[in-house]
Interface confidence: low
């Protein structure tokens, strides 16, 4: 049996994945739980097994199809239920009417690469992964650069208010190791949130030429 309050949060990656986290304050002892997705529009349903991520929270990914397939649209409603086994029965622990395009979290940008590096600047590009064609150009990005002796949390955020998959970092220090990350967010959706940060891209600025100020 389960007591206490629960929180059930899910996000759609805009293509073929719904990721869910279920948090339960009460004790959950040796119980198998799953998320069940029943789309109102589609002739399929999907389940995933909730796996513990901490003492009181579980997560799973509903894989709806091939990674780049457009499995849901802006008018879909997906009934999401947390079901936990109680003996031979499944008990509904949480339920929500999930509107995919109101609850978006895209995949982290991929394929970060240095296009051009100099002593004081670096041009970096990236690609978005598994993002719906519905967005067209309605995306924004945040980027951050890790400087020596600082933490990611201290890094100032650079905001790109349009779908621009590159950035030119200025005022860098010559011959210095940096790391760079970027994340993406659609403009659509009341509960939409930022994607995870991309994998860091490490790069080094060129050393200053002796006797020259570049």
């Amino acid at each position: 049996a389960v007591n206490g309050t629960s929180q059930f949060t899910c996000f759609y990656n805009s293509r073929a994945n719904i990721s869910c986290v279920w948090s339960q304050d009460g004790a959950l002892q040796d119980t198998s739980c799953q998320v069940h997705a029943w789309p109102d529009r589609r002739r399929w349903n999907q389940t995933c097994e909730l796996l513990p991520v901490s003492q009181a929270s579980w997560a799973c990914n509903l894989i709806l199809g091939a990674p780049d397939s457009q499995k849901l649209t802006t008018v879909d409603i997906v009934t999401l239920r947390v079901l936990c086994r109680e003996g031979v029965r499944w008990r509904v622990m949480a339920i929500q009417d999930f509107k995919p395009f109101e609850n978006l979290r895209l995949m982290a940008p991929i394929s970060l690469q240095v296009v051009h590096v100099e002593t004081h600047r670096c041009n970096i590009s990236w690609e978005i992964s598994q993002a719906s064609h519905y967005f067209e150009r309605h995306l924004e990005f945040e980027a951050r650069t890790l400087s020596p002796g600082h933490t990611w949390e201290e890094a100032p955020l650079l905001t790109l208010k349009q779908k621009q998959e590159w950035i030119c970092l200025e005022t860098l220090t010559p011959d210095t190791q940096y790391e760079f990350q970027v994340r993406v967010k659609p403009l659509q959706g009341e509960f939409t949130t930022w994607s995870p940060w991309s994998q860091p891209l490490a790069f080094r600025t060129k050393p200053a030429a002796l006797g020259k100020d570049t």
């Epitope: 789309p39 109102d40 529009r41 649209t73 008018v75 009934t79 339920i95 929500q96 009417d97």
Partner: antibody, heavy 119, light 106 residues
Framework: EVQLLESGGGLVQPGQSLRLSCAAS????????VHWVRQAPGKGLEWVGV???????DYNAAFISRFTISRDNSKNTLYLQMNSLQAEDTAIYYC?????????????WGQGTLVTVSS | DIQMTQSPSSLSASVGDRVTITCSGS?????MYWYQQKPGKAPKLLIY???NLASGVPSRFSGSGSGTDYTFTISSLQPEDIATYYC?????????FGQGTKVEVK
């Protein structure tokens, strides 16, 4: 067998309120979205709104300020609360449910209940 | 809102005739639905998802189309087909219906 039975219609004066009921049988309202559709005399069909299986609602913007859809799970019954009624709200009000997949179209309809708004 | 325009608004045909009704959307829609309504009765679903026949519906009814233009056909009109027919889109909210086509027998 899936059945929907509307009730609560009648004659009301302009500005008054009315609550329509839709008793569902053959399925549980926590498993399917149920819609309200209205039809003015001699006119076409107009979608009012829906209450989804989890309890959330979507409305036609034309009605969102005056109409509220709710339900009583224990009675397996849906409601349409209509406030500030006007003559143009005179219509037959139907509740409808889609097939096993809610976008299979409105496969199930009630018989409708007539609301007449007149002084 | 997507406006659905049906044509014709009414038609008269003989038993056995092929009857075609068109429905045009003000914007592109993904799925179209067709209903039959007889006087004093609730609508009855005939076609779902553009071209699929609802359960128990005779095969003389069919639907086709894509984008903004959809067609509903009765291949051989029968006396019991006298009714008003409505198209409906379910691609965006609010859901909208055509104004109806009244089919009569000559």
């Amino acid at each position: 067998e899936v059945q929907l039975l509307e009730s609560g219609g009648g004659l009301v004066q302009p500005g008054q309120s009315l609550r329509l009921s839709c008793a569902a049988s053959g399925f549980t309202v926590t498993s399917y979205g149920v819609h309200w559709v209205r039809q003015a005399p001699g006119k076409g069909l107009e979608w009012v709104g829906v209450i989804w299986s989890g309890g959330s609602t979507d409305y036609n913007a034309a009605f969102i300020s005056r109409f509220t859809i709710s339900r009583d799970n224990s009675k397996n019954t849906l409601y349409l609360q209509m406030n500030s009624l006007q003559a143009e709200d005179t219509a037959i009000y139907y509740c409808a449910r889609a097939g096993d997949y809610n976008y299979d179209g409105f496969a199930y309809w009630g018989q409708g209940t007539l609301v007449t708004v007149s002084s | 809102d997507i406006q659905m325009t049906q044509s014709p608004s009414s038609l008269s045909a003989s038993v056995g005739d092929r009857v075609t009704i068109t429905c045009s959307g003000s914007s592109s829609v993904s799925f179209m639905y067709w209903y039959q309504q007889k006087p004093g009765k609730a609508p009855k679903l005939l076609i779902y998802d553009t071209s699929n026949l609802a359960s128990g519906v005779p095969s003389r009814f069919s639907g086709s189309g894509s984008g903004t233009d959809y067609t509903f056909t009765i291949s051989s009109l029968q006396p019991e087909d006298i009714a008003t027919y409505y198209c409906q889109q379910w691609s965006t909210y609010p859901l909208t219906f055509g104004q109806g086509t009244k089919v009569e027998v000559k």
